[in-house]
């Protein structure tokens, strides 16, 4: 806290300019009027203030706006944003995407801080849903943003926003998140033709059910092994050898290298060995010929 001292003669600030960088903390406190600061916030970012000085300026704004800053001030905070606490930000009502962009720009190149997370949360809640423009902006600054949301939060993403998602945005998503995103992606891309559709839907397939994988196997998509390995195990298990062969196309040879890893390992255990042998890859571990497979889960469901 800066002591309350009188402003020295001739040092009262008439405008926010570069001369203020030479003011000591107590002089900034005594000589800069908070209302002047608020009206000239757009100048602050261009002036090489230290963070110590920015603390003083923040204190002045806090006194002027104890209930939270107006958006006209927030939009021009610049580096002063880094001095805000999540508690400060929770008092704000940020509605403009331009304001959001301006503040994210300050933190660009750095990991998401608690301040940024709070800002985004306030902004998205204020909008009611994660619209395409917002998602575009957030994933541009933070590619992992989408995967930081809970399945419940992801449910508010409209299908139209899925067009903004790039494959790398989904890199850290877990199956629960992809379960929510996949149906939205399927809806968003439903009017595309086969090959274009597959290119777009590929990143979301970790949430695809068996019936959709079966349908894809009929479309000559040539899924790569990396995508196949991210599929839900429960969705892969019911696929036949013929369906997997069609799904992977020339990439089917990669199964051999992955035969000890899920979902390939579990899928092999469900296939007849003579069916696996038709692939000519030397996959082992299938059901020996002549054995009868009873699906007890199906039997229980029927009784």
């Amino acid at each position: 806290e800066v002591e309350k001292t009188a402003c020295p003669s001739g040092k009262k600030a008439r405008e926010i300019d570069e001369s203020l960088i030479f003011y000591k903390k107590w002089e900034l406190e005594a000589c800069v009027d908070a209302a002047l600061l608020a009206t000239q916030m757009d100048r602050v970012n261009a002036i090489p203030f230290t963070y110590e000085q920015l603390d003083v300026l923040k204190h002045k704004l806090d006194e002027l706006y104890p209930q939270g800053y107006p958006e006209s001030v927030i939009q021009h905070l610049g580096y002063l944003f880094l001095k805000m606490s999540p508690e400060d930000i929770r008092k704000w009502n940020v509605t403009s995407l331009e304001t959001l962009k301006a503040l994210l720009e300050v933190n660009k190149g750095h990991e998401m801080s608690p301040q940024v997370a709070t800002l985004i949360d306030r902004f998205v809640k204020g909008r009611g849903q994660l619209d395409k423009d917002t998602l575009d902006t957030l994933t541009a600054f933070y590619p992992g943003y989408l995967c930081s949301l809970s399945p419940e939060e992801l449910s508010s993403v409209p299908p139209s926003s899925i067009w903004a998602v790039r494959p790398q945005d989904l890199d850290t998503c877990d199956p629960r998140q992809l379960d929510v995103l996949y149906p939205k992606a399927r809806l968003a891309f439903q009017n595309m033709n086969g090959s274009e559709y597959f290119v777009k839907i590929q990143s979301f397939l970790g949430g695809a059910p068996t019936e959709d994988l079966k349908a894809l196997s009929q479309q000559n998509v040539s899924m790569d092994l990396a995508t196949f390995m991210k599929l839900r195990t429960d969705a892969v298990l019911p696929l036949t050898v013929a369906e997997v062969q069609k799904l992977l196309g020339p990439h089917v040879e990669g199964l051999k290298a992955e035969e000890r890893h899920r979902p390939v390992r579990d899928w092999i255990l469900r296939q007849r060995q003579d069916d696996l042998d038709t692939l000519g890859l030397g996959l082992q571990g299938g059901i020996p010929n002549g054995y009868l497979v009873l699906d007890l889960s199906m039997q229980e469901a029927l009784s």
Partner: nanobody, 115 residues
Amino acid sequence: EVQLVESGGGLIQPGGSLRLSCAASGNIGSIRHMGWVRQAPGKERELVATITTVGTTYYANFVKGRFTISRDNSKNTLYLQMNSLRAEDTAVYYCRATAHPTDYWGQGTLVTVSS
């Protein structure tokens, strides 16, 4: 984290010249601007000069025309060329960097102007 190490201080006669250096290391990509701050015995610290990442310079009135701040990005070094030194320039000179999200300081180098 940014580390700053000053050098170049010493005893100099009035009217003489000195060049201070400040070697920066660590996360230097996060630096927004750097400056020289001095503290004379029994006085408050005061900003002498600042230089931004794009090379814009600012000087305190008491050193204008005598001191020049510069930086060599290839060597990650900040300089302060001090000419026409006076007795009142005697102080510990600190290098300071404002970098995301705080201010970093060197340990200081003593400049004594005396005959």
